[in-house]
């Protein structure tokens, strides 16, 4: 069929459009967010001018007093549900916490994100505020917490109903007992990390990393998992923007890979299967009233009664339309043309949609494809500001500005910091540290043998696409003998306190070494001490590449291990062994890098890579393959995507972004006892 011109607009059944006039929208908005009182503004005769001027001033918009396009655009922007003027009614007290050890309870979860990702987003959001105040935040598991976090829809039990997708995203109450201090998130939103639906992968070679949407495969762009390039029908995705160049992938949740709960121990579906005498070749909701999709895990459910629930595919589960919750079907036919990805054809608003059967023309079943979603981390950080007593800011760049704005930069603005410090004061200077006593080392992780799915070898890759070796950057020749170069500090402008994220951090001798882009700094703890440097890595360790992933010193032998990509260099004094490939240490081809190390008894280390860890024998320079374990099993509460793990003063530090999670090990219980900034809290950098 000839290609449809963009001007062909189609009436989609079940497409909900608001019938509010601009005037009605404005009246509703001005009342809801505190700019007018109850019935003050109803009716065409009333002038909105004064209230609009108030709103424009508060939101730093051009102050025209008119319902102009900038004002209407602001009113249509997704935002926090807390009023801008006046409070959520009148709570008693001065609306700040009078203790500094704040507790929080995550009462329930959204199904949009894995629970560990939600836990992590909230922990990072709290860390923003603890980094600039004397407040600490501890997760508890009871409603006695100061801050209760809840996902809810519509009327969810607090008298402030949510409004469906978009619009009002979340709200929180000022400090105090009961509902006060609580933060509620609208679960009709798509919660993500701000850059599209989060789909964790299994197997493949990306260590469980989430899919990257969109991604390029064989020159084509994909915004959902695909079975292209495979003959076994397993959906997969790239975990970087370009599979063709990076070759990193994982398998998406699929009933062909595993099922959840049920009674079949997670075995994959068996298609076709017999249920009540009928044959099924896909998951079904038949026989259930709750809408859950399930399948048999043997060929005959009637005989074997073995089943599991089919995992949801967030990347292709539609929202709205007339098929909410169902999966896109690719390819589908629309106006006689075949589509293998979501499209905006037929719509005037540019929104992406898909059919949920193979033929829209005949079935008219459709829904919107997942959008970028809202960053749970950013929205939570904003709501927690309210839960600590902050009102909305009129500075558009501030975190406490009422409108949602995605940013990957540091979320806190000076206005936010000034506001929170007005309530609680600044973070106190670190006390001089008493002599440290050694704490018990982490014990060896439980022996867990990774088991692959029946039909997929863990390192299997999509059959199409280049599979060349990982590229190793140029490395200098192994050098023997002492280096003649002296380590002269470079320009003092190169201050460690200005470094956002270090490549690697390690305790060498009794000093902390911080590595970044071919340079390093040394730091000795003490009142008023500052990091020294930077020095050139090449002057001290000439064999090393500029970019390091992790570094550690083995105390007994004083050997220094430097990891970069799939390679390791071992320095003993000035002599070097390496580069050696990671497989020489017993780490398989699916381990792309070593992201950190911790001591684990005499001559033993724990090596980390993404979400996994291994026990490493320094003398034998070999990992015990049976010791492979999940990081969050041994260190619950640390982020999933740490880029560096190191030991300092007998405590373990897990770094993510500019933050660290400190774990103290007491009687085999590894507990996070502090979250802070590497620069401010370890290096004692000034905060301004």
């Amino acid at each position: 069929a000839p290609r449809q011109r963009q001007s062909t607009l189609v009436l989609f059944p079940g497409d909900l459009r608001t019938n509010l006039t601009d005037r009605q929208l404005a009246e509703e908005y001005l009342y809801r967010y505190g700019y007018t009182r109850v019935a003050e503004m109803r009716g065409e005769s009333k002038s909105l001018g004064p209230a609009l001027l108030l709103l424009q001033k508060q939101l730093s918009l051009p102050e025209t007093g008119e319902l102009d396009s900038a004002t209407l655009k602001a009113m249509r922007t997704p935002r926090c549900g807390v009023p801008d003027l006046g409070r959520f009614q009148t709570f008693e007290g001065d609306l700040k916490w009078h203790h500094h050890n704040i507790t929080y309870w995550i009462q329930n979860y959204s199904e949009d994100l894995p629970r560990a990702v939600i836990d992590d987003a909230f922990a990072r959001a709290f860390a923003l505020w603890s980094a600039v105040t004397p407040l600490t935040f501890t997760r508890v598991y009871s409603r006695d917490a100061d801050i209760v976090i809840q996902f809810g829809v519509a009327e969810h039990g607090d008298g402030y109903p949510f409004d469906g997708k978009d619009g009002l995203l979340a709200h929180a109450f000022p400090p105090g007992p009961g509902i006060q201090g609580d933060a509620h998130f609208d679960d009709d939103e798509l919660w993500s990390l701000g850059k599209g639906v989060v789909v964790p992968t299994r197997f493949g070679n990306a260590d469980g990393a989430a899919c990257h949407f969109p991604f390029i495969f064989e020159g084509r762009s994909y915004s959902a998992c695909t079975t292209d390039g495979r003959s076994d029908g397993l959906p997969w995705c790239s975990t970087t923007a370009n599979y063709d160049t990076d070759d990193r992938f994982g398998f998406c949740p699929s009933e062909r890979l595993y099922t959840q709960d049920g009674n079949a121990d997670g075995k994959p579906c068996q298609f076709p299967f017999i249920f009540q005498g009928q044959s099924y070749s896909a998951c079904t909701t038949d026989g259930r009233s709750d809408g859950y999709r399930w399948c048999a895990t043997t060929a005959n459910y009637d005989r074997d009664k073995l089943f599991g629930f089919c995992p949801t595919r967030a990347d292709s589960t539609v929202m709205g339309g007339n098929s909410a919750g169902e999966l896109c079907v690719f390819p589908f036919t629309f106006l006689g043309k075949e589509y293998s990805t979501c499209t905006s054809e037929g719509r005037g608003d540019g929104r992406l949609w898909c059919a949920t059967t193979s033929n829209f023309d005949s079935d008219k079943k459709w829904g919107f494809c997942p959008d970028q979603g809202y960053s749970l981390f950013l929205v939570a950080a904003h709501e927690f500001g309210h839960a600590l007593g902050l009102d909305h800011s009129s500075v558009p760049e501030a975190l406490m500005y009422p409108m949602y704005r995605f940013t990957e930069g540091p979320p806190l603005h000076k206005d936010d910091v000034n506001g929170i410090r007005h309530l609680y004061g600044p973070r106190p200077e670190p006390e001089p540290r008493p002599p440290t006593t050694t704490t018990p080392q982490p014990t060896a992780p439980p022996t867990v043998c990774p088991t692959g799915p029946p039909t997929v070898h863990p390192s299997e890759r999509p059959t199409a696409g280049p599979t060349g070796p990982p590229s190793a950057g140029p490395t200098g020749p192994p050098t023997a003998g002492p280096s003649t170069a002296t380590t002269v500090p470079l320009s003092p402008v190169d201050d460690a306190c200005n470094v956002n994220i270090f490549d690697a951090i390690a305790e060498i001798g009794n000093q902390l070494y911080l590595f970044k882009d071919g340079k390093y700094w040394r730091f000795s703890e003490g009142r008023g001490s500052r990091p020294q440097g930077p020095f050139l890595i090449a002057d001290k360790w000439p064999a090393l590449p500029r970019k390091l992933d992790s570094v550690f010193e083995e105390r007994l032998s004083k050997k220094l291990f430097f990891f970069s990509g799939r390679q390791v260099w071992v320095y003993t004094g000035a002599s070097v062994l390496g580069p050696r490939r990671l497989d020489k240490l017993g780490l398989g081809a699916d381990v792309a890098q070593v992201t950190g190390a911790l001591r684990s008894g005499r001559g033993k280390m724990l090596l980390f890579s993404g979400r996994r860890l291994w026990r490493f024998d320094v003398k034998a320079q070999m990992v015990d393959p049976r010791s492979a374990s999940e990081v969050d099993r041994m260190f619950p509460g640390v982020p999933l995507d740490t880029h560096d793990v190191f030991q300092y003063r007998e405590k373990a530090y897990f770094c993510q972004d500019r933050f660290y999670w400190r774990v103290s090990s007491r009687s085999e219980l590894n507990q996070v006892d502090q979250v802070g900034y590497v620069t401010y809290d370890i290096l004692q950098c000034p905060e301004d």
């Epitope: 959520f88 329930n108 409603r143 829809v153 009327e155 402030y160 007992p177 509902i179 709750d290």
Partner: antibody, heavy 116, light 108 residues
Framework: EVQLVQSGAEVKKPGASVKVSCKAS????????ISWVRQAPGQGLEWMGY????????NYAQKLQGRVTMTTDTSTSTAYMELRSLRSDDTAVYYC?????????WGQGTTVTVSS | QAVLTQPPSASGTPGQRVTISCSGS????????VNWYQQLPGTAPKLLIY???HRPSGVPDRFSGSNSWNTASLAISGLQSEDEADYYC?????????FGGGTKVTVL
């Protein structure tokens, strides 16, 4: 001690109205919501609705919409539930309960009998 | 209006373990959180378990709750004579609170 004390038993004729009170003590009244639940003789629990004491917003069970009104008086920390156009099947014990991720504190109950 | 379905009765001898189920008919209990209440004869109900599995202070640890897919469960291990009562599950569904029909637990 956190408690809710309800008004005494009522006997009403069909078509009449009843207003039950629930006085809270031992906690910050305006920081919680109040749910009303009733239980007909020999039957289970039926949720009637909810009022948030901090903003007086209400959420009523669909079945009772138009017949029930819930209010609060924050100066006396008291919640009220009024049910109009009473019928014989409204005969029940009426409970108020503090509602915060579960109804954790309950009043002793008020028996309302509707009989001609 | 959604309905939560509970078995009308359950029984056990002292020391036994009794489990009561609660399932949603037209909505997903597994994606909601469930509370459980105990009502002793002639008294007001008492919150026993909140948010699927949490016990308020003062509730003995022989009471435990769970919620998976479309069934929530209340378990009483080491049944005692004072546990003879009616037990109700409760959840939110589309802006309304819903109670189960109740389960009468008898200690034999």
């Amino acid at each position: 001690e956190v408690q809710l004390v309800q008004s005494g038993a009522e006997v009403k004729k069909p078509g009449a109205s009843v207003k039950v009170s629930c006085k809270a003590s031992g906690y910050t009244f305006t920081s919680y919501g109040i749910s009303w639940v009733r239980q007909a003789p020999g039957q289970g629990l039926e949720w009637m609705g909810y009022i948030s004491a901090y903003n007086a917003n209400t959420n009523y069970a669909q079945k009772l919409q138009g017949r029930v009104t819930m209010t609060t008086d924050t100066s006396t920390s008291t919640a009220y539930m009024e049910l109009r156009s009473l019928r014989s099947d409204d005969t029940a014990v009426y409970y108020c309960a503090r509602d915060y991720y579960g109804m954790d504190v309950w009043g002793q109950g008020t028996t309302v009998t509707v009989s001609s | 209006q959604a309905v939560l379905t509970q078995p009308p009765s359950a029984s056990g001898t002292p020391g036994q373990r009794v489990t009561i189920s609660c399932s949603g008919s037209t909505f997903n209990i597994g994606s909601n959180t469930v509370n459980w209440y105990q009502q002793l004869p002639g008294t007001a109900p008492k919150l026993l378990i909140y948010s699927d599995s949490h016990r308020p202070s003062g509730v003995p640890d022989r009471f435990s709750g769970s919620n998976s897919w479309n069934t929530a469960s209340l378990a009483i291990s080491g049944l005692q004579s004072e546990d003879e009562a009616d037990y109700y599950c409760q959840a939110w569904d589309s802006s309304a609170v819903v109670f189960g029909g109740g389960t009468k637990v008898t200690v034999l």
